[in-house]
């Protein structure tokens, strides 16, 4: 008897997983934050520009890129010590002699306002206040971000307990 | 309790050698820059070395390069600096100090220890 | 190298006047400036950075302004707590991070 009385639990969880399903939710993974359409992960320990770059490559996302002052501000806000900063998808590329984002567009001179030089070899970071620029293998803190994707919430019959 | 406990000063003769130690507590050691700065008796400050959080990146100042190492555990907490080769000019009482994390390596020092003192003479 | 020069080397001042203490940089140094302040016997203490952000819980008396290569610290209304030498630092990114040669605030 022992097995058919498993079989039925089984049917049952399962009937249960098809009756509770919800409508498709935007979620952002555990640990990262909401901004807008964007989920952000601030990171918890140092690194040089580059391997900051890489660790979010690792966690399929990128370092943070910013589309204006507003995304700036509300970025700024979610950073509670004046004494902690991080670094950004921005960089100085000495060929096109402009700083350009890891997606390969350009700063455009409204929107951010970098303090320092820009020069080879510099990657830019922000502040609670600020924007600046730094030497690459500076080894500061960084934000990765990715797209807000489409979860199939579930219900877990866990609990229902 | 956030501090920082030098260590391992004392009297050596000139050409002598000395191991400073610096333990860090109450903060994650290894996600600041750490320096050592100098002051000799009734004189002013003196910026000595300092070391990224991950030890890839050193600087020295040009009194003391190529006697003076600067090193750091991050598992133990602690900074240090071996000074080989001292000289009547290196008498001082030596800081560790910990960087603001939020200017990269302009290096403004937010966290200092008691300071050990260091005496060369024969 | 990048030189500082503190001026006055030495001031005398009464508990509630007004201190002002200057550092001249050898060259531009943008806003890449702090201030200390050393009692005898202790270490420094970080009192400004960024040539005008004060730092947490240091006194609101005290500010710091300029940039470029002309900087003030200013204590406006000076304590007995306030006696003590203090030393401007450079900071731009390539070491070495200099400092002042200092300014003794004394009683009056």
């Known amino acids: 008897q022992k097995p058919s009385i498993g079989k039925c639990s089984v049917d049952i969880q399962q009937n249960r997983t098809k009756t509770t399903e919800r409508p498709d939710l935007l979620n952002c993974p555990i640990y990262w934050q909401q901004v807008q359409e964007k989920c952000l992960l601030f990171s918890h320990t140092v690194n040089p520009w580059n391997n900051s770059l890489a660790d979010c490559s690792t966690k399929e996302s990128s370092l943070l890129l910013i589309q204006d002052k507003d995304e700036l501000t509300r970025t700024q806000n979610l950073i509670h010590d004046k004494a902690i900063s991080f670094w950004i998808g921005l960089n100085f590329s000495l060929s096109e002699k402009n700083w350009k984002w890891i997606n390969g567009s350009f700063l455009s001179s409204n929107d951010l306002k970098i303090t320092g030089d820009a020069k080879e070899n510099s990657c830019v970071y922000i502040s609670q206040t600020s924007v600046y620029s730094e030497y690459c293998s500076t080894e500061m803190k960084w934000i990765c971000q990715k797209e807000l994707t489409l979860v199939r919430n579930k219900v877990s019959p866990d609990s229902w307990l | 309790q956030v501090q920082l406990v030098e260590s391992g000063g004392g009297l050596v003769k000139p050409g002598g050698s000395l191991r400073l130690s610096c333990a860090a507590s109450?903060?994650?050691?290894?996600?600041?820059?750490m320096s050592w700065i100098r002051q000799a008796p009734g004189k002013g400050l003196e910026w000595v070395s300092y070391i990224s959080p991950s030890g890839a990146t050193i600087y020295y100042a040009d009194s003391v390069k190529g006697r003076f190492t600067i090193s750091r555990d991050n598992a133990k907490n602690s900074l240090y600096l071996q000074m080989n080769s001292l000289r009547a000019e290196d008498t001082a009482v030596y800081y560790c100090a910990r960087s603001l994390m939020s200017t990269g390596t302009h290096l403004y020092f937010d966290l200092w220890g008691r300071g050990t003192l260091v005496t060369v003479s024969s | 190298d990048i030189q500082l020069t503190q001026s006055p080397s030495s001031v005398s001042a009464s508990v509630g006047d007004r201190v002002t203490i200057t550092c001249r940089a050898s060259q531009g140094i943008s806003s890449w400036l702090a201030w200390y302040q050393q009692k005898p016997g202790k270490a420094p203490k970080l009192l400004i950075y960024a040539a005008s952000s004060l730092q947490s819980g240091v006194p609101s008396r005290f500010s710091g302004s300029g940039s470029g290569t002309d900087f003030t610290l200013t204590i406006s209304s000076l304590q007995p707590e306030d006696f003590a030498t203090y030393y401007c630092q450079q900071v731009t990114s390539v070491p070495p991070y200099t400092f002042g040669g200092g300014t003794k605030v004394e009683i009056k």
């Open positions: 109450g903060f994650t050691f290894s996600d600041y820059y």
